[in-house]
């Protein structure tokens, strides 16, 4: 399954929107910085097959979409930018979903790397718990916004590797 070029453009647009969503200076939130343990090895496109990488990408985008679809998120961000950002993610999910469905239908496809899915889920659990702990403060959201920009950048790199594998 070939991800359309528009998928990468969408990812870049999502990153730009996320950058624009910043409301406060990151420097005023230095005391709130946190290492969420982004599972970088899951974004090493050479580590596993394309079909598995697409499942990991889907999980990453889906969890990001869910994170920014909460009521707490709606209260934290400028509404029109948040809606545009969510729309970009939703479009990416549709592209990835079509690919995963195609792979699921092929019986020779190897089993999904479930530990990679779990690693992504745990990463977002750490982010969720951090926000809860910090009571969804503006600085907590700013730290999370910066972290998601980082994780989306990693997923962009993974997509580039996947296209080279075609």
């Amino acid at each position: 399954c070939d991800l359309p070029q528009t998928h990468s453009l969408g990812n870049r647009r999502a990153l730009i929107l996320l950058a624009q969503m910043g409301r406060i200076s990151p420097f005023s939130c230095l005391k709130d910085r946190h290492d969420f343990g982004l599972p970088q090895e899951e974004f090493d496109g050479n580590q596993f097959q394309k079909t598995q990488a697409i499942s990991v990408l889907h999980e990453m985008i889906q969890q990001t979409f869910n994170l920014f679809s909460t009521e707490d998120s709606s209260a934290a961000w400028e509404q029109s930018l948040l809606e545009k950002f969510s729309t970009e993610l939703y479009q990416q999910l549709n592209n990835l979903e079509a690919c995963v469905i195609q792979e699921v239908g092929m019986e020779e496809t190897p089993l999904m790397n479930e530990d990679s899915i779990l690693a992504v889920r745990k990463y977002f659990q750490r982010i969720t718990l951090y926000l809860t702990e910090k009571k969804y403060s503006p600085c907590a959201w700013e730290v999370v916004r910066a972290e998601i920009m980082r994780s989306l950048s990693f997923s962009t790199n993974l997509q580039k590797i996947l296209r080279r594998k075609d």
């Epitope: 499942s55 889907h58 889906q62 969890q63 979409f65 869910n66 679809s69 999910l93 990835l96 979903e97 995963v100 469905i101 699921v104 999904m112 479930e114 530990d115 779990l118 889920r121 745990k122 977002f124 659990q125 750490r126 969720t128 718990l129 809860t132």
Partner: antibody, heavy 119, light 108 residues
């Protein structure tokens, strides 16, 4: 609000199969993995597996791989679990539960379907 | 798979009494992925405590959770009649996800 609706009971004969349903409402069905859990009378809970309704990928507990098959129908926002070659060991209540994170992990459960395997 | 052992299997407590239920894991579980559920007869389980020590919405403040590694506990500071139920610990730190066999808590 989030709801997961399951039929109350199913009576099936040994050796037969049964397909249990879990109809979701109150949230975007394709955004969250759906899990299935078994509970024998007066016993603990056993995780059977999960399915991502968005694309149909499944992850199973090895103990249930040859027993359960998880599927979804996006058009009717319903998750299904087929149990095959039923024996008395399969008589139990089967719950569906929605995934999520933090305070949303297994925060929503169906009422459970009691499966009775009897001749 | 990670086996979760709960003790005691059944216990009874008087109103006002302090109660501690334990959950022992066969191998280490990260505290972020250790949860507790309450279940009453004829009902589905209810999320009670998430990530070891956080109370789910609507759970009374007399409940608390603690632990790390292989040893976890749920404590009720002052038992009330409505707390009579079964309590299950659960881990999703690694596949397959597992539950404890449960502790049935009765009121004296």
């Amino acid at each position: 609000q989030v709801q997961l609706q399951q039929p109350g009971a199913e009576l099936v004969k040994p050796g037969a199969s049964v397909k249990l349903s879990c109809k979701a409402s109150g949230y975007t069905f394709t955004n969250y993995w759906m899990h299935w859990v078994k509970q024998r009378p007066g016993q603990g809970l056993e995780w059977i597996g999960e399915i991502n309704p968005s694309h149909g990928r499944t992850i199973y507990n090895e103990n249930f791989k040859s027993k359960a098959t998880l599927t979804v129908d996006k058009s009717s926002i319903t998750a299904f679990m087929q149990l095959s070659s039923l024996t008395s060991e399969d008589s139990a209540v089967y719950f569906c539960a929605r995934g999520g994170l933090g305070p949303a992990w297994f925060a929503y459960w169906g009422q459970g379907t009691l499966v009775t395997v009897s001749a | 798979q990670i086996v979760l052992t709960q003790s005691p299997a059944i216990m009874s407590a008087s109103p006002g009494e302090k109660v501690t239920l334990t959950c022992s894991a066969g191998s280490s579980v990260d505290s972020s992925y250790l949860y507790w559920y309450q279940q009453k007869p004829g009902s589905s389980p209810k999320l009670w405590i998430y990530s070891t020590s956080n109370l789910a919405s609507g759970v009374p403040a007399r409940f608390s959770g603690s632990g790390s590694g292989t040893s976890y506990s749920l404590t009720i500071s002052s038992m009330e009649a409505e707390d009579a139920a079964s309590y299950f610990c659960h881990q999703w730190s690694s596949y397959p996800f597992t539950f404890g066999s449960g502790t049935k808590l009765e009121i004296k």
